[in-house]
């Protein structure tokens, strides 16, 4: 969390981000709030990035300004305009690329004052996995499949039974390059799999950390996934 | 509220380039861009390119080398030109405006101009 | 280039029955992908942006649903009025493309 006040003349006020990370070619949000304004005209947004020339977005006099946006923007982004009154001068981004990544300014202004915050936005690739039993190998295996990920992660694979134990000899990753030529697809078997455990195969890079979990019994499979986002810290 | 229309020569002849001006009304150039679609008789729609908010421009890169989107934003005038018209260029000609400053949906259309390429 | 196809290419339905229209890309578009009502001689009218949400005025009979590359669009119980030609359009990436559109008739 990145808190940060104005130092002008005008009073300060409190501008508030938080660090994320954006998925390559979906949506993403740049969060940013402050203190609200009665008056919705009397609020100006900027957004800014390091290194880049033009604006990311504004917003002001009630409506979006963009007379100024930098080209690699265009067209792809918007604040949630309704919300602006109540203090989220958060940024929709449309179609997350890896350049996206950097420092952003969440610059704001109101009749109470001026204030900005920093924002770090880092940009990759991440998916959920999902871990199923191979029945077409030889042996008992397991095979965790997660169709999109960027840089490429370390995958661990772990058990309940034998905690602590090391598979790297037992299990094989591979990635794929998909076809856009940036995210992979992850494949990794785990051999030699006993029943009535539960195995849990990690795949992580400096995003995100996701978890896939399969409990193989002799009556039933079950499973479960997650995934966290590493970088939330705000500012 | 929101309004957009065109105007445009209706008859081209071969060869010869095409002109269409859309006025607006309703918003603000500086807050949107304005895009531009043409439907032949008959048949689909095809997106021609848009004109930014900031001035600067994308195109179909199957008429990039023909077209050329500029703007007046004190005037609300947006200005299409297209040069060296074929028949196959006929068509009913549309500026539109997204919904919001993120493209995901055209909600304002111009009535359409009627273009027949024709000696 | 992203291909959006459109099926079927016309149909003809009863007053009152379910019509469900389908497009789908020829790459993943997220949910950018929104739908349009042309009736004769007029221009086309944005009924669903974003996939799934209804665009103001819109009758809730209107229905957009999917992601990726699978598009639909329901009319719960269609009416007379709906005679019309419907487009679906991605705006994921350049070039903005649409599909072939389907006719709607009414019997």
């Known amino acids: 969390l990145i808190i940060g006040f104005g130092i002008s003349g005008r009073h300060s006020i409190t501008v508030t981000t938080v660090a994320s990370a954006g998925n390559i070619g979906e949506d993403g949000i740049l969060s940013c709030t402050f203190e609200p304004d009665i008056k919705l005209s009397d609020i100006v947004i900027q957004w800014l990035k390091e290194g880049v020339l033009g604006l990311v977005h504004e917003f002001k006099e009630g409506k979006d300004e963009l007379s100024e946006q930098d080209e690699m923007f265009r067209g792809r982004t918007a604040v949630f305009a309704d919300q602006v009154i109540v203090g989220n001068a958060s940024l929709r981004l449309k179609n997350v690329q890896l350049t996206d990544a950097g420092t952003y300014k969440c610059y704001i202004i109101t009749s109470k004052g001026k204030g900005n915050a920093n924002l770090e936005y880092k940009t990759g690739a991440f998916s959920m996995p999902e871990v199923n039993v191979d029945y077409n190998a030889s042996s008992e295996t397991l095979r965790c499949e997660a169709p999109r990920w960027f840089p490429q992660p370390t995958v661990v694979w772990a058990s309940q039974v034998d905690q602590g134990a090391n598979f790297s000899e037992v299990s094989n990753t591979s990635f794929e390059l998909n076809s856009e030529n940036v995210t992979m697809k992850v494949v990794s078997v785990l051999y030699n799999v006993t029943i009535n455990n539960t195995y849990s195969c990690m795949i992580e890079n400096d995003i995100a950390k996701a978890t896939g979990d399969i409990k193989v019994t002799e009556s039933e499979i079950k499973r479960r996934s997650h995934l966290q986002l590493l970088n939330s810290k705000a500012s | 509220q929101v309004q957009m229309q065109e105007s445009g020569p209706g008859l081209v002849q071969p060869s010869q380039s095409l002109s269409i001006t859309c006025t607006v009304s309703?918003?603000?150039?500086?807050?949107?861009?304005v895009q531009w679609v043409r439907q032949s008789p008959g048949k689909g729609l095809q997106w021609l390119g848009v004109?930014?908010?900031?001035?600067?421009?994308d195109y179909n890169a199957a008429v990039i080398s023909r077209l050329s989107i500029s703007k007046d934003t004190s005037k609300s005038q947006v200005f299409f030109k297209m040069n060296s018209l074929q028949p196959d260029d006929t068509a009913i000609y549309y500026c539109?405006?997204?919904?919001?400053?993120?493209?995901?949906?055209?909600?304002?259309w111009g009535q359409g101009t009627l273009v027949t390429v024709s000696s | 280039i992203i291909v959006m196809t459109q099926s079927p290419k016309s149909m003809s339905m009863s007053v009152g029955e379910r019509v469900t229209l389908s497009c789908k890309a020829s790459?993943?578009?997220?949910?950018?992908v929104s739908w349009y009502q042309q009736k004769p001689e007029q221009s086309p009218k944005l009924l669903i942006y974003?996939?799934?949400n209804r665009y103001t005025g819109v009758p809730d009979r209107f229905t957009g649903s999917g992601s990726a590359t699978d598009f639909t669009l329901t009319i719960s119980s269609v009416q007379a009025e709906d005679l019309a030609d419907y487009h679906c359009?991605?705006?994921?990436?350049?070039?903005?493309?649409f599909g072939s559109g389907t006719k709607l008739e009414i019997k």
């Open positions: 539109a405006r997204d919904i919001t400053t993120i493209v995901e949906g055209f909600a304002y």
């Open positions: 309703g918003f603000s150039l500086t807050s949107y861009g």
């Open positions: 004109i930014w908010s900031s001035g600067s421009t």
């Open positions: 790459e993943n578009v997220g949910t950018y």
């Open positions: 974003g996939a799934s």
């Open positions: 359009g991605q705006s994921y990436s350049y070039p903005f493309t």
